[in-house]
Interface confidence: medium
């Protein structure tokens, strides 16, 4: 009714003293690799020969943080950034910063990034859309209540307004250029 | 650890501005931002506003007119200026440090503030 | 601006009771946050950003949802879970809004 080698699972390392036999009842836990995160149960039981358990070890890391308009990231920079690692904004001269100057990697999802915008209510150039572009040529700075205007590349169709207005130094959102469906 | 506190006058009379000053410990403004919310008798929670780490502020659009947040970072400590007040301020407040995603995860204890002639 | 409707106002549950508050946004929101309050005492966070447990919290609670409905579950009720409790959404287009609270009492 002993048990015999651990069982491994997937970026789970068995904590402890390892040992060729388990007594029936024997509790062994798993703790998870950097970057994962323990989902449900760490530990296996010798039962009847046989580990019960299936300790789960879930990837909480993040990879490329928020693009922010007029700013750039002041913290280090790394392929990958652990569940609970923050990094840093700094808006472009002349942009002020609202909001949270950081974003934190949250269990994979990174929360909201800040916004850096003129406080005279100007805005930059128009963001760029995939497989679509403006219809006028794009200039460095907008004044405010300006629109500009997007159409997509052939096959590509237009979901959304297709005219943003810039307003309090943000632009509306803009449309997406979505691929027709083929049936 | 970390550890924020509010202090300040108990009593205030109408018309007055009320002044809080939050006392923060374990971490720096420099890298928080921190909340003033305030809590009715009673009642639910009302967002004050925020000052970032950076330094720049956003209130709630209905008190805007009345409140300035303001920080002292070498010493630790984040006013909240409430201008013109009446017994609709009567609350208790508290101020609170940003987690992200405009979430709080620490809370001083809170002040209780009379506004009353 | 958005609102958050929580419902019930109030509910009566008995310990080991599994309870189920629940907030409604008045347009889609990314993320909410629930918090709870003990009378005298300051508010303490809960679940951030919908889903994630704050430090400390039992895994008895948990939250959920998207778009304009969220729900804040306790799998079984214990008697230090008697309090009320808010949700909490931010944007960086919206101010900060709180619902209303529900109030879990002893049955």
């Known amino acids: 009714t002993d048990c015999l080698s651990l069982p491994s699972f997937e970026n789970a390392i068995p904590m402890g003293e390892k040992k060729d036999v388990y007594k029936a009842g024997e509790q062994v836990t798993y703790t998870c690799a950097t970057y994962y995160k323990m989902d449900g149960a760490s530990n296996v039981t010798c039962i009847n020969s046989r580990w019960t358990g299936r300790p789960t070890c879930r990837d909480t890391s993040c990879v490329n943080p928020p693009t922010v308009q007029n700013a750039y990231i002041v913290s280090r920079q790394m392929s990958k950034y652990p569940s609970g690692e923050r990094v840093r904004y700094q808006c472009r001269s002349p942009y002020e910063m609202f909001g949270d100057e950081e974003v934190m990697c949250l269990n994979g999802n990174w929360t909201e990034p800040p916004q850096c915008k003129d406080s005279t209510g100007k805005c930059g150039p128009p963001p760029p859309i995939d497989n679509g572009d403006i219809t006028s040529f794009p200039l460095s700075v907008y004044a405010p209540a300006s629109s500009v205007e997007y159409q997509c590349q052939n096959l590509y169709q237009l979901e959304g307004n297709k005219r943003i207005t810039c307003r309090n130094g943000q632009w509306s959102e803009p449309p997406k250029c979505l691929h027709p469906c083929v049936i | 650890q970390v550890q924020l506190q509010e202090s300040g006058p108990g009593l205030v009379k109408p018309s007055q501005t009320l002044s809080l000053t939050c006392t923060v410990s374990?971490?720096?403004?420099?890298?928080?931002?921190v909340y003033w919310i305030r809590q009715h008798p009673g009642k639910g929670l009302e967002w004050i506003g925020v000052i970032w780490s950076g330094g720049t502020t956003e209130y709630n659009p209905s008190m805007k007119s009345r409140v300035t947040i303001s920080k002292d970072t070498s010493k630790n400590q984040v006013s909240l200026k409430l201008s013109s007040v009446t017994a609709a301020d009567t609350a208790v407040y508290y101020c609170?440090?940003?987690?992200?995603?405009?979430?709080?995860?620490?809370w001083g204890q809170g002040t209780s503030v009379t506004v009353s002639s | 601006d958005i609102q958050l409707t929580q419902s019930p106002s109030s509910l009566s549950a008995s310990v080991g009771d599994r309870v189920t508050i629940t907030c409604k946004a008045s347009?889609?929101?990314?993320?909410l946050h629930w918090y709870q309050q003990k009378p005298g005492k300051a508010p303490k966070p809960l679940i951030y950003a919908t889903s994630n447990l704050a430090s400390g919290v039992p895994s008895r609670f948990s939250g959920s949802g998207s778009g304009t409905d969220f729900t804040l579950t306790i799998s079984s009720l214990q008697p230090e879970d008697f309090a009320t409790y808010y949700c909490q959404h931010r944007s960086s287009s919206n101010p900060l809004t709180f619902g209303a609270g529900t109030k879990l009492e002893l049955k």
């Open positions: 347009s889609s929101v990314t993320y």
């Open positions: 374990g971490f720096s403004l420099t890298n928080y931002g």
């Open positions: 609170a440090r940003n987690f992200g995603n405009y979430a709080m995860d620490f």
